[in-house]
């Protein structure tokens, strides 16, 4: 159903990384505009991105209120210049999104190695604790704040002079690894949420090697 000059949105897709969350859809509008509504399963609908010609809507501000809730969005289509017009059933044409639970589904962003420090035959590698847009008591929480021990990091490290890799994991943001004295090492990390079934792993961080700026060496 619907008016003759509007089409329903389709391919509604959640795009979310570290809780920055955007709903995307098709088609590009021709003589129509869209409004998005979002709700938790038990909550009221809240309208966002009013009468837009975009095919995306940033819903981060809504989902960060409770990242463990499950959200549903819907996209309404209206004729351009006549947003009061409704479909044949007396209401605007709309399409529902898939359900989305940010805590379980947001993609893990590419991590960054913040620093590494060598003391003798040990190296401490620190992963940057990225800030998210999730707030508590008026402060933004880090990824570790949100996920706690549910989030682990896998470290890959290898001698600059060789291809054989080693690995370690941590449920903090720090690794303490043994290295051979006098050897330079390279490092890369990956974020993982073991308990998930989807979107479990991040892409690898950029490689950082000893002898570059981020490192520090002490005997």
């Amino acid at each position: 159903s619907g008016t003759t000059n509007t089409v329903a949105a389709y391919n509604l897709t959640w795009k979310s990384t570290n809780f920055k969350t955007i709903l995307e859809w098709e088609p590009k509008p021709v003589n129509q505009v869209y409004t998005v509504q979002i709700s938790t399963k038990s909550g009221d609908w809240k309208s966002k991105c009013f009468y837009t010609t975009d095919t995306e809507c940033d819903l981060t501000d809504e989902i960060v209120k409770d990242v463990k809730q499950t959200y549903l969005a819907r996209v309404f289509s209206y004729p351009a210049g006549n947003v009061e017009s409704t479909g044949s059933a007396g209401e605007p044409l709309y399409e529902n999104s898939p359900e989305f639970t940010p805590y379980l589904e947001t993609n893990l962003g590419q991590p960054t190695i913040q620093s590494f420090e060598q003391v003798g035959t040990k190296v401490n590698v620190t992963v940057e604790d990225e800030r998210t847009l999730v707030r508590r008591n008026n402060t933004f929480l880090s990824l570790r704040d949100v996920f706690g021990k549910d989030l682990i990091y896998t470290l890959y490290y290898w001698k600059s002079s060789s291809s054989g890799k080693k690995t370690a994991k941590t449920n903090t943001n720090e690794f303490l690894i043994d290295v051979d004295k006098g050897e330079n090492y390279c490092f890369s990390v990956q974020a993982v949420i073991p308990s998930r079934t989807v979107n479990r792993k991040s892409t690898d961080s950029p490689v950082e090697c000893m002898g570059q700026e981020k490192g520090e060496f002490r005997e």
Epitope: A168, Q190, P194, K201
Partner: antibody, heavy 117, light 107 residues
Framework: EVQLVESGGGLVQPGGSLRLSCAAS????????MHWVRQAPGKGLEWVGW????????IYDPKFQDRFTISADTSKNTAYLQMNSLRAEDTAVYYC??????????WGQGTLVTVSS | DIQMTQSPSSLSASVGDRVTITCKAS??????LSWYQQKPGKAPKLLIY???SLADGVPSRFSGSGSGTDFTLTISSLQPEDFATYYC?????????FGQGTKVEIK
């Protein structure tokens, strides 16, 4: 249902090569780490190595680094263990296992490799 | 590399007994230790991860304790289906290392 099925085992002469396969179903291997573990007859478990199928990163026990190669084909949802220069002491049941990054939650039934002349 | 020393290598016990198996790491591995049960001709099965967390579907008579270098698997009341070989695994850094195994037999 999650399932891992190893194949490719059999009798091989010392110095020979063999490629084992671990076909996964019920999940996407690129979302996990995949390991190979072996067990010689009447002996304990021995870790061989792992692969992250998404990016190809591999980690080996150093004792296997030179002779064994782990790979994966995400389009076939299969991990592989290529074993070269095989010795009698490589005779074992070879298992693949899925790693969540916290634990090995699913294992295959194993495939027996016998190295003998 | 980390060495895992598991003891005892075998033990005899009766149904209903409390059984304790220990694993000692050659250096601090924090809580990166898991326990597996293996029956003859079968693949290992996860029991405990992160030293103390019970895996899904595993009976509550199994428990794990310890951190750092000393770890324990306890079966509070041994059942007939628990007669098997048990392995600890240090899985926090490579190379991952299994203990030598503990065979739990019927007395």
């Amino acid at each position: 249902e999650v399932q891992l099925v190893e194949s490719g085992g059999g009798l091989v002469q010392p110095g020979g090569s063999l490629r084992l396969s671990c076909a996964a179903s019920g999940f996407n291997i690129k979302d996990y780490y995949m390991h190979w573990v072996r067990q010689a007859p009447g002996k304990g478990l021995e870790w061989v190595g792992w692969i992250d199928p998404e990016n190809g990163n591999t980690i080996y026990d150093p004792k296997f680094q030179d002779r064994f190669t782990i790979s994966a084909d995400t389009s076939k949802n299969t991990a592989y263990l290529q074993m070269n220069s095989l010795r009698a002491e490589d005779t074992a049941v070879y298992y693949c296992a899925r790693d969540t990054a916290a634990y090995f939650d699913y294992w295959g039934q194993g495939t027996l490799v016998t190295v003998s002349s | 590399d980390i060495q895992m020393t598991q003891s005892p290598s075998s033990l005899s016990a009766s149904v209903g007994d409390r059984v304790t198996i220990t694993c000692k790491a050659s250096r601090d591995i924090k809580s990166y230790l898991s326990w597996y049960q293996q029956k003859p001709g079968k693949a290992p099965k996860l029991l405990i991860y992160y030293a103390t967390s019970l895996a899904d579907g595993v009976p509550s008579r199994f428990s794990g304790s310890g951190s750092g270098t000393d770890f324990t698997l306890t079966i509070s009341s041994l059942q007939p289906e628990d007669f098997a070989t048990y392995y600890c695994l240090s899985d926090g850094s490579s190379p991952f290392t299994f203990g030598q195994g503990t065979k739990v037999e019927i007395k």
